[in-house]
Interface confidence: low
Amino acid sequence: PEPPTACREKQYLINSQCCSLCQPGQKLVSDCTEFTETECLPCGESEFLDTWNRETHCHQHKYCDPNLGLRVQQKGTSETDTICTCEEGWHCTSEACESCVLHRSCSPGFGVKQIATGVSDTICEPCPVGFFSNVSSAFEKCHPWTSCETKDLVVQQAGTNKTDVVCGPQDRLRA
């Protein structure tokens, strides 16, 4: 018969012959022949292959290096890689999460609009009029100025985006 020029899905062409690919989680030991089927072997511990393949070596599971601020989010299997995420207070620098950096803090005068996650940084926003933040923080929102009126006090010092108002007693008229 005429040798094939193309093979079906999950097959590969070698020596004018279509051989079966190894399934995910297994690596190629030997190609098929006219008489024998493709020989595959399961990946070892801490190894994986995630596609139908003809690889002779499995890939090593990703190492979540604690020195780079990484920890395991999902343990790898023979068919999937380990998924890393960042330690508390850090976030990934890329989708692959190969390393982590410290969450940004919002300076005084700015509050946290969105708290950072393992994959996204802190988003800060300027404190609007009537609000303040006097700390550099990755968690604190802008706080509203104290309402002196509700305490039967008057404003002695106006607030800013970095400081609260200062309340004081009302001047009492002498009899």
Epitope: L68, T93, S99
Partner: antibody, heavy 120, light 110 residues
Framework: QEQLEESGGDLVKPGASLTLTCKAS?????????MCWVRQAPGKGLEWIGC??????TYYASWAKGRFTISKTSPTTVTLQMPSLTAADTATYFC??????????????WGPGTLVTVSS | ALVMTQTPSSVSAAVGGTVTINCQAS??????LSWYQQKPGQPPKLLIY???TLASGVPSRFKGSGSGTQFTLTISDLECADAATYYC????????????FGGGTEVVVK
Amino acid sequence: QEQLEESGGDLVKPGASLTLTCKASGFDLSSTYYMCWVRQAPGKGLEWIGCIYATGGTYYASWAKGRFTISKTSPTTVTLQMPSLTAADTATYFCARDIVGDNIYYFNFWGPGTLVTVSS
Amino acid sequence: ALVMTQTPSSVSAAVGGTVTINCQASQTISNELSWYQQKPGQPPKLLIYLASTLASGVPSRFKGSGSGTQFTLTISDLECADAATYYCQQGYTYSSVDNVFGGGTEVVVK
């Protein structure tokens, strides 16, 4: 006194590799700094290449990712590895320090730059 | 991807005059924008950060304003020493960007 100094710039042929070094003095790169590389082709604007954080975490410009490699080789030294250079990589290469934790990324300290010329 | 567009590419004004440089972000960056001055043969120098905060030692003739996507650098009472190229830089993110800098504006002082 805080200082950054780049070295390793040279005249090389297309296809050659080059490693630039940025040496910091007066401060320690183990603090919460990004050390960044920025380049500037003759008569052109500033082009950000990427940054490395104190822990070794890196960010790259999308065009530089997979092409250039930024590494921290000591507490005071950062390198930029540039393989397979082309004429388009001819530029002055600056390293710059970036503060983190101040609500914004900005380059508050720069080295004088080192010139890389790629020509046959 | 986040892109910074600076206009004009060149501007000219007389000593004592005023120039305005614009910088537009392709998405909102809050107030996370810096301005730099660069003279030939020198590295850039930080002028303004957080859109309007003057860096140490920068004269008050330099004024930054804006937030969101539109930002402006205004230089008043122009001096000969202000002749330089000025760049804006977004400080919002380093993720998935081609360049954090705008294209630059050359200021010529007559």
